[in-house]
């Protein structure tokens, strides 16, 4: 065996283990004939704290008093320095600085499940920084005792490995933990308990749910529990919710009826158990059961709106639109919508099932009184039909809302305001605000949006399907019985100057004046609602300011006459467009020379 300290020794007094704040004496002494050759008086013993010199002495031994050592471990090393040679390592020693253990606090014991074993936890108090041994003792009836030790540096948990049984559930047991290290010992206060106090049941398992006759109103939750369980608590919530519904039940025997579940909703269920009304603790929550409740027939009614379009003298196109039911109203997966169209006087009726759409278009005669009914169907049944009489929504001029305005209200919102119609305002049953993207061709495929407003409201904030830099055609309808009046306006939530001007595609001469025709600016370049077009013209090769004509914007207009040009003079013409934010750049330039006679 190699002797690491063959040249000398390091001794520590009073001990290698000291209380924080204490002083230690460290002695380094050379063994016989281990000093510097020839010059033993020249022995220079040096004491290092780790690698930092703290003391030295000439001779065969060195004594050093050390104070102020920190908590934890410090390594001291003694070396010998001789003339003309490297320092020689003599020996080393560790000193451990710590404190006596504090009294362990909050000792508590638990047995997980009726077949589990007793385990206790406690709070150690402040770190001793020393090797500390913990002994846990349990004493029970008939002088029975059990003991377990733990030598882990951070010991605050021990399992006795014994199982308490329910034969005498009221028998008392007492636990105590004692901490011991080189500087002292301390014991916890005793903790006394019975079987019922410390047994924490295992969480329930094998959780199932049954819906009798596939109905949400006849729902039973089943589970399995340990034999002695008396109480259960159930918690459940829709999977998309953070709030739990809680139910406490006694002597449930592994089943409970739930009466307030919503149809067609995924729920999460958990159960916990307890052995006694006021003793012991609740088990952990069981693993979650996730289950979807069955469908029920839809409630509520569809919000239906429509549009009429004249085709010819005998036919009209009806486009029906409806909004999806809310999840709580649909109460299942909507399989189809049933649309019934009926001529009220002749009683002719046509029914159609629509899947995958929330709109329907058909052509009907312009004569007769027509009504539609729309309902939503899932696997369990249909909602109540929404019935609408088809009328000319804008026929009653006296019902037209007045002073309609549309103003941007923050990002992607438009505030629509109006005044009640001149005709008795109290006759209005409701207002409908309708909006759709403005397309110059009057495209009927453009999605329609609407909202309903109570008769006492004179404003509505529209935000659904509103995009920046897009112009919307907004209509406000006032409905009264089988009559309606409407007013319209253009509006946008955000605008800037158009990106381009109109493209002049033709200039024709008519009776001494000219007719300018242009192509509309593409919708994506309009950047909001157009207010005006400007037509500019000036003589070719002239440096004079151009003349201009400003035309109010109308959706369908794409030509305009100008009659102030001189004959046989060549002009250059171009156009711009304006929104409330400014004027576009020039469109294309066209030259034209009027051939007519001079006045």
């Amino acid at each position: 065996k190699i002797d690491a300290c063959k040249r000398g020794d390091v001794t520590v007094k009073p001990s290698h283990v000291i209380l924080l704040g204490s002083t230690v004496n460290i002695t380094c002494s050379l063994k016989p004939r281990q000093g510097c050759f020839h010059y033993s008086r020249r022995n220079k013993l040096i004491l290092y704290k780790f690698d930092r010199r703290i003391n030295f002495h000439h001779g065969h031994s060195l004594n050093s008093q050390v104070t102020g050592l920190p908590l934890g471990t410090t390594l001291f090393v003694c070396k010998l320095a001789c003339i003309n040679s490297d320092e020689i390592q003599i020996c080393g020693a560790e000193i451990f600085v710590g404190v006596a253990p504090e009294q362990p606090q909050n000792l508590s014991c638990i047995q997980k499940g009726e077949q589990g074993t007793v385990a206790c936890t406690w709070e150690r108090g402040r770190d001793t920084h020393l090797y500390t041994e913990y002994t846990l003792q349990l004493s029970g009836p008939k002088n029975l005792t059990w003991q377990k030790q733990c030598k882990d540096i951070y010991c605050d948990y021990l399992d006795f490995g014994i199982n308490l049984t329910p034969e005498s559930p009221e028998s008392n047991f007492t636990a105590k933990v004692t901490a011991v290290n080189s500087l002292g010992s301390s014991s916890s206060l005793p903790s006394t308990f019975t079987f019922l106090d410390i047994v924490r049941p295992l969480p329930p398992w094998d959780i199932r749910i049954k819906f009798q006759k596939a109905s949400v109103s006849r729902c039973t939750l089943y589970w399995r529990d340990e034999g002695l369980v008396l109480l259960n608590r159930l918690r459940y919530r829709p999977s998309n919710s953070r709030l739990w519904n809680m139910v406490n039940v006694t002597k449930a025997k592994g089943r409970h009826d739930l009466l307030d579940l919503k149809p067609f909703t995924e729920y999460e269920f958990q159960i916990s158990s307890k052995l006694h009304l006021y003793k012991g603790s609740w088990s952990d929550w069981s693993e979650s059961l996730r289950a979807q409740t069955p469908e029920e027939e839809p409630t509520g009614m569809l919000d239906v709106w429509y549009m009429k379009r004249h085709i010819d003298y005998s036919r009209q196109q009806i486009s029906l639109f409806w909004k999806n039911l809310s999840v709580s109203e649909a109460r299942g997966k909507i399989l189809h919508y049933q649309v019934t169209l009926q001529e009220l006087t002749g009683g002719k009726a046509m029914t159609q099932n629509i899947t995958g759409h929330t709109s329907w278009t058909t052509v009907i005669p312009r004569t007769g009184n027509w009504a539609v009914a729309v309902s939503a169907a899932n696997s369990k049944g249909s909602s109540l039909p929404t019935r609408i009489n088809i009328m000319n929504l804008c026929e009653a001029g006296l019902l037209a809302p007045r002073q309609v305005s549309a103003n941007s209200e923050g990002m992607d919102n438009i505030l629509v305001t109006w005044q009640p119609p001149r005709k008795d305002p109290s006759a209005v049953q409701e207002y409908v605000v309708e909006w759709r993207e403005l397309h110059p061709g009057g495209d009927t495929q453009v999605p329609l949006n609407w909202l309903r407003s109570r008769p006492y409201n004179v404003s509505a904030l529209i935000s659904e399907n509103i995009k920046s830099y897009i112009c919307y055609e907004i209509r406000v309808y006032a409905l009264s019985g089988d009559q309606g009046g409407c007013s319209s306006i253009l509006g946008n939530s955000k605008h800037k100057a158009p990106l381009s001007g109109p493209h002049i595609n033709a200039i024709t001469e008519e009776k001494g004046s000219i007719l300018i025709s242009w192509n509309s600016i593409p919708v994506q370049e309009q950047m909001g609602c157009l207010l005006h077009y400007r037509i500019y013209w000036k003589e070719r090769d002239s440096n004079s300011q151009p003349q201009l004509c400003e035309i109010p914007y109308r959706v369908s207009q794409n030509s305009h006459p100008i009659n102030s040009l001189q004959p046989r003079v060549t002009y250059v013409l171009w156009m711009t467009a304006l929104t409330a934010a400014g004027e576009s750049s020039h469109g294309n330039e066209r030259e034209f020379c009027l051939q007519g006679k001079a006045n």
């Epitope: 290092y48 690698d51 934890g72 390594l75 390592q89 080393g92 020693a93």
Partner: nanobody
Framework: QVQLVESGGGLVQPGGSLRLSCAAS????????MSWFRQAPGKGPEWVSA??????????YYADSVKGRFTISRDNAKKTLYLQMKSLKPEDTAVYYC????????????????RGEGTQVTVSS
């Protein structure tokens, strides 16, 4: 008393492998960084590798001359430090010894508190 005893040295051919061990006793081992040094004949000590205090997942450091060939590890339960040496070269010939050290280990020689006597490694064909 603090003691570090190296073993595992010997004669090996170039390209061969050796595993050195350093058994610690008389001190707590776990709270200290540990290093391997080597000293070739007629030369001063050269730091080879170090491992942080604590578990086997402690950070490791290597001199450029041995990077990718040597691996340092420790087993705190056995109070033992290891150096696995592969692809050995004649210039690796030296006395290898372990030491209780403190960093840094990047650009300067680490601080040494205590070292073992060493074990001879000879790489020769």
């Amino acid at each position: 008393q603090v003691q570090l005893v190296e073993s595992g040295g010997g004669l090996v051919q170039p390209g061969g492998s050796l595993r050195l061990s350093c058994a610690a006793s008389g001190f707590t081992f776990e709270p200290y960084d540990m290093s391997w040094f080597r000293q070739a004949p007629g030369k001063g000590p050269e730091w080879v590798s170090a491992i942080d205090k604590g578990g086997g997942a402690g950070a490791t450091y290597y001199a450029d001359s041995v990077k990718g060939r040597f691996t340092i590890s420790r087993d705190n339960a056995k109070k033992t430090l290891y150096l696995q040496m592969k692809s050995l070269k004649p210039e690796d010939t030296a006395v290898y010894y372990c030491a209780i050290t403190a960093g840094p280990y990047s650009d300067s020689t680490p601080r040494v508190a205590y070292r073992g006597e060493g074990t001879q490694v000879t790489v020769s064909s």
